[in-house]
């Protein structure tokens, strides 16, 4: 026989020959970095037709890297589903705690010996630091001076020194999340109110009241013979102003006896399919909407349209 | 939390064959191996084996080769154990358990009784 | 194949006393990186088997620190510094360096 195979997990005991007689036997052993777990036979023959008898290395195993729990509160997972050297332990923690250290560890040879490349990290709670403190209000547990992961804390205003009281502005309640960090912003408080909304030729038909503070919503709408212009509900936003705008009552023209040119529908004021009436932003048309509110035919003003692109 | 829940009792004739089942959950099936310990009446524990859930990758003990199968089936997260021509010394509590080669039981199953009897 | 004996294969014991466990290797189970090789398991009546101490010494998730393994090569000692009820069962050593196997287990009862 000629030399016997090689194999990458074990290597020949000696010095290969350039020949071997009939009979003669070989013995491996496992390779730096392998260990040999029985029973499989690590030995060939060279047999009479001038091969080896059939023999593998499936008894030598890579060395493997010490068992590393599960951090307390977390997850350690190999990767590559093996603690064998080359490959990787992952660790990750459970939901409310964050990781101190390595996140992934190797599995390293160094000699013949299998070790991880560091130590294995922790998984410590997820604490935040108090809430920011706000102007004319407070906060729940203002007295804690540490707060765990999820704990939430709710803000309220104070009472106002004046006739108007104090609105709460943004979220009321916020909680500790995953970074340390709280979920929003802190909310403010501070004095909102709106004008007395007024729209001629129309009238208000819900959200009555003397005051309007924040979040205040009224609901308008037109006189006979005359259409909305905005949006038919408003409501009084963090900087004292109606949004959408106060809408106006325009009059309705009355139905002019020229026939209109034919329009295309790319002259609308939105790629929707409502009225110009009930667009709240984008440019104005200067024709008005006749009163049947079917946006494909306008009536121009006076028979004509100002301008056509 | 991490489980390894087993397949039911079973009678077995001598000579027939038994599978039974080890159904994970709570971790990544496919990152550790199963082993498979048994347990005759009122006697210690017996390592059967190991599967690598990862490879497919087997080891079985001495005393079992050529008689006991290890398979896994990573789609359902469930290891297999599957014994043959059983004789009346088969009869035990069988175990899986979550570990490496090299490495430690840290999780069980609740075990499954096989008793081989005429 | 490596062998494990343990002694005393009973243990009778007293709630609050200390109890020990020695379990002998055929050969060494101190592998070249620095670490043995050696698991304790404790079996409680009816229950699975459940990890104790790994690698000879390190105690395992949500092992009370009454348990701790000591030793090296073929000596490896369990030690229960107070014993309580819930520890009565059937205490395993394993070894993990050739393949796995057991020793003969060491029954704790109360006295």
């Known amino acids: 026989c000629e030399e016997p195979p090689t194999f990458e997990a074990m290597e020949l005991i000696g010095k290969p020959k350039p020949y071997y007689e009939i009979g003669e036997r070989v013995d491996y052993k496992c390779k730096k970095g392998y260990f040999y777990i029985p029973p499989l036979a690590t030995h060939t023959i060279c047999d009479r037709n001038h091969t080896w008898l059939p023999v593998s290395d499936d008894a030598c195993y890579r060395e493997t890297c010490p068992y590393i729990r599960d951090p307390l509160n977390g997850q350690a997972v190999p990767a590559n589903g093996t603690y064998e050297f080359g490959y990787q332990m992952h660790f990750i923690c459970n939901e409310g705690y964050y990781l101190i250290g390595e996140e992934i560890l190797y599995c390293e040879l160094k000699g013949s010996v299998a070790i991880w490349s560091g130590k294995p990290p922790i998984c410590e709670k997820v604490l935040c630091t108090p809430p920011p403190k706000i102007k004319n209000g407070k906060h729940t547990f203002s007295e804690v001076e540490v707060f765990e992961y999820l704990d939430a804390v709710t803000y309220s205003c104070d009472p106002a020194p004046g006739p108007d009281p104090f609105s709460l502005i943004g979220e009321s309640t916020i909680y500790c999340g995953d970074n340390s960090v709280w979920s929003r912003a802190a909310p403010e408080c501070k004095v909102v109110k709106c004008r007395f909304p007024v729209v001629e030729n129309g009238k208000q038909i819900s959200g009555f009241g003397k005051k309007f503070y924040y979040k205040a919503t009224v609901m308008f709408e037109c006189d006979k013979g005359f259409y909305l212009d905005g949006s038919d509900t408003i409501v009084c936003d963090s900087n004292s102003t109606w949004d959408p705008p106060v809408p106006k009552c325009l009059k309705v023209l009355p139905p002019s006896s020229t026939k209109p040119p034919a329009l295309s529908h790319s002259v609308s004021t939105s790629s929707t399919t409502k009225s110009p009436a009930s667009s709240a932003s984008g440019p104005r048309p200067t024709y008005k909407p006749p009163v049947s509110n079917y946006p494909g035919y306008p009536k121009p003003e006076e028979g004509i349209l100002d301008s056509l692109d | 939390q991490v489980q390894l829940v087993q397949s039911g009792a079973e009678v077995k004739k001598p000579g027939a064959s038994v599978k039974v089942s080890c159904k994970a959950s709570?971790?990544?099936?496919?990152?550790?191996?199963i082993s498979w310990v048994r347990q005759a009446p009122g006697q210690g524990l017996e390592w059967m084996g190991w599967?690598?859930?990862?490879?497919?990758?087997?080891n079985y003990a001495q005393k079992l080769q050529g008689r006991v199968t290890m398979t896994t089936d990573t789609s359902t997260s469930t290891a297999y154990m599957e014994l043959r021509s059983l004789r009346s010394d088969d009869t035990a509590v069988y175990y899986c358990?979550?570990?490496?080669?090299?490495?430690?039981?840290?999780?069980w199953g609740q075990g499954t009784l096989v008793t081989v009897s005429t | 194949e490596i062998e494990l004996t343990q002694s005393p294969l009973s243990l009778p014991v007293t709630p609050g006393e200390p109890a020990s466990i020695s379990c002998r290797s055929s050969q060494s189970l101190l592998h070249s990186n620095g670490y043995n090789y050696l698991d304790w398991y404790l079996q409680k009546p009816g229950q699975s088997p459940q990890l104790l101490i790994y690698l000879g010494s390190n105690r395992a998730s949500g092992v009370p620190d009454r348990f701790s393994g000591s030793g090296s090569g073929t000596d490896f000692t369990l030690k229960i510094s107070r014993v309580e009820a819930e520890d009565v069962g059937v205490y395993y050593c394993?070894?993990?360096?050739?393949?796995?196997?057991f020793g003969p287990g060491t029954k704790v009862e109360i006295k």
């Open positions: 394993m070894q993990a360096l050739q393949t796995f196997t």
């Open positions: 599967i690598s859930a990862y490879n497919g990758n087997t």
């Open positions: 358990a979550r570990g490496m080669m090299r490495g430690v039981f840290d999780y």
């Open positions: 709570g971790y990544t099936f496919t990152s550790y191996g």
